[in-house]
């Protein structure tokens, strides 16, 4: 009777344990006079012979499939051949594609890192992960891993980022997509401008004056404070689009620098001082604005 | 591929005015912020005109230089972009870019138009 | 206005040549919020449109070659070109975009 080599299981699935066991026929003598050697395909496998009639191995892949047997030798060299077994490992088809975010919810600030991070719930082998981004699905990046997650960085996220993204996951099973995410680029307010409009060249004391604060970018809503010597003259805000205004009826306590503040949750940024000063010409009973 | 097509500019007299026009394509036009930007014969560049996207309004930006004579709008049925220029002043000669703004920096240009302004 | 002042204003090199190139700014341009500086560089080659390099005073943009480099923080800034190619030959600009934006006069590459 020859030799019998046992698979546990007989049908592994990727990415598990097989134990391959070679087993002495029962009128031959005791395991210890004999070396074994396990051979999948015409190749030896891991320590080569040994005097171990167990192999263990640790993680098997769709590509060790094949045709498995063992071969024991006693100690004159007399060599005994196993039958050849079929093992299939089983690939797990992947499932439950879902495309993460970090920072999660989909909102990052601008300048910040952004990474697209694809899973799936199950699947095994290599699996190959796809990134698109946009309507017409164009295809940012695509690795190939033994790993159920896989991700897509942005180093530093632009406005060109703000779009939809979805991922890819396949292993051989057809594509399986994950769900639209939709990401958000928060704009910090960028340093403002301060415009002082007055109703006439030089303006005179009881005349109004119209303070206009702008930043030219940051997302919205936009909050505006005014200053006159870092002392607070009033807010304003610009719920979207354009800056926002504060009117100012002068007094001779009004000379002096002006500033404003442009503020939206992700950072303030103040403007570049304005000097108005008051003059009083000789004989003349008005102060004179000039900048 | 992003296109970015400028025309509209020619000779004009001063004190004239000028409509330029850009067609836009391979982008989602709506969500960006466009500027027109113009380089003076052998000179740098310098920015013009800003117009921002409908989710903040339109919102339009002048350089001084311009103020109170350009007009920059947007068509996004038809990914259009457009500069209005009026009393038009020799120093306005230059090639006039029409320009992607993403996160301030801008990585789409045209190839540009040309407006001299002379008598 | 931001003031953005380059040097040197032309630069003479041969093919494979290391070259830097400077940008000052009359204020930091480094943002609070995201600690990022809000600098850019272009490329503009003879009878052709400006062309962006890097944003972010380091972010290289997508298909530039890598042999084009920015670095630099608050106020000082520079470009490097670790070996200068024929096709280099360009004036190259600063440009903030920290507030309202603002070029700098460029600096043009030439050959030797």
């Known amino acids: 009777a020859g030799l019998l080599l046992i698979v546990s299981p007989s049908h592994p699935t990727e990415g598990s344990p097989v134990n391959l066991t070679c087993k002495m026929p029962s009128l031959q003598s005791s395991d210890a006079q004999f070396q074994f050697c396990f051979f999948r395909d015409d190749q030896a496998l891991g320590p080569g012979w040994s005097s171990s009639p167990k192999l263990q191995i640790a993680n098997m892949w769709k590509e060790d499939s094949g045709s498995y047997w063992c071969e024991a030798q006693t100690m004159a060299s007399k060599v005994l051949r196993s039958w050849r077994s079929q093992i299939n490992v089983h690939r797990v088809p992947v499932a439950d594609v879902s495309l993460e975010t970090q920072p999660p919810g989909g909102q990052v600030m601008e300048g910040d890192r952004l990474v697209l991070i694809c899973s799936v719930a199950m699947g095994t082998g290599d699996i190959t992960f796809l990134w698109y981004k946009g309507a017409i699905g164009l295809n940012l990046q695509t690795k190939t891993q033994r790993s159920l997650t896989a991700e897509y960085e942005i180093p530093t996220a632009r406005e060109s980022d703000a779009e939809q993204y979805y991922c890819v996951a396949e292993n051989g099973y057809g594509p399986r997509p994950s769900g639209l995410v939709s990401i958000t680029v928060r704009i910090p307010v960028s340093r403002p401008i301060l415009m002082v409009r007055a109703p006439r060249a030089q303006a005179v004391v009881g005349d109004v004056l119209k303070l206009h604060c702008e930043a030219l970018r940051g997302s919205h809503p936009i909050l505006y404070w005014f200053y006159h010597e870092d002392v607070i003259l009033g807010s304003s805000s610009a719920p979207s689009g354009g800056g926002a205004s504060f009117n100012l009826s002068l007094t001779a306590e009004h000379s002096g620098n002006y500033s404003c503040e442009a503020n939206n949750g992700l950072g303030a940024q103040r403007s570049e001082e304005v000097t108005l000063n008051f003059t009083v010409p000789t004989g003349a009973r008005s102060n004179h604005l000039t900048s | 591929e992003v296109r970015l097509v400028e025309s509209g500019g020619r000779l004009v007299q001063p004190k004239g005015s000028l409509r330029l026009s850009c067609a836009v394509s391979?982008?989602?036009?709506?969500?960006?912020?466009m500027y027109w930007i113009r380089q003076a014969p052998g000179k740098g560049l310098e920015w013009v005109a800003r117009?921002?996207?409908?989710?903040?309004?339109?919102?339009?930006y002048y350089a001084d230089s311009v103020k109170d004579r350009f007009t920059i709008s947007r068509d996004d049925s038809q990914s259009m972009l457009y500069l209005q220029m009026n009393n038009l002043k020799t120093e306005d000669t230059a090639m006039y870019y029409c320009?992607?703004?993403?996160?301030?920096?801008?990585?789409?240009w045209g190839q540009g138009t040309t407006l001299t302004v002379s008598s | 206005d931001i003031v953005m002042a380059q040097s040197p204003s032309s630069l003479a090199v041969s093919v494979g040549e290391k070259v830097t190139m400077s940008c000052k700014s009359s204020?930091?341009?480094?943002?609070?919020?995201?600690?990022?500086?809000?600098l850019a560089w272009y490329q503009q080659k003879p009878g052709q449109s400006p062309n962006l390099l890097i944003y972010?005073?380091?972010s290289r943009e997508s298909g530039v070659p890598d042999r084009f480099t920015g670095s630099g923080s608050g106020t000082d800034f520079t470009l490097t070109i670790s070996s200068v190619q024929a096709e280099d030959l360009a004036t190259y600009y600063c440009?903030?975009?920290?507030?309202?934006?603002?070029f700098g006069a460029g600096t043009k590459l030439d050959l030797k």
């Open positions: 320009v992607r703004d993403n996160s301030g920096s801008f990585d789409y």
């Open positions: 391979g982008f989602t036009f709506n969500t960006y912020a």
């Open positions: 117009i921002r996207s409908k989710t903040n309004n339109f919102a339009t």
């Open positions: 204020q930091s341009l480094l943002h609070s919020s995201n600690q990022k500086n809000y």
């Open positions: 972010w005073a380091s």
């Open positions: 440009q903030q975009y920290y507030s309202y934006p603002t």
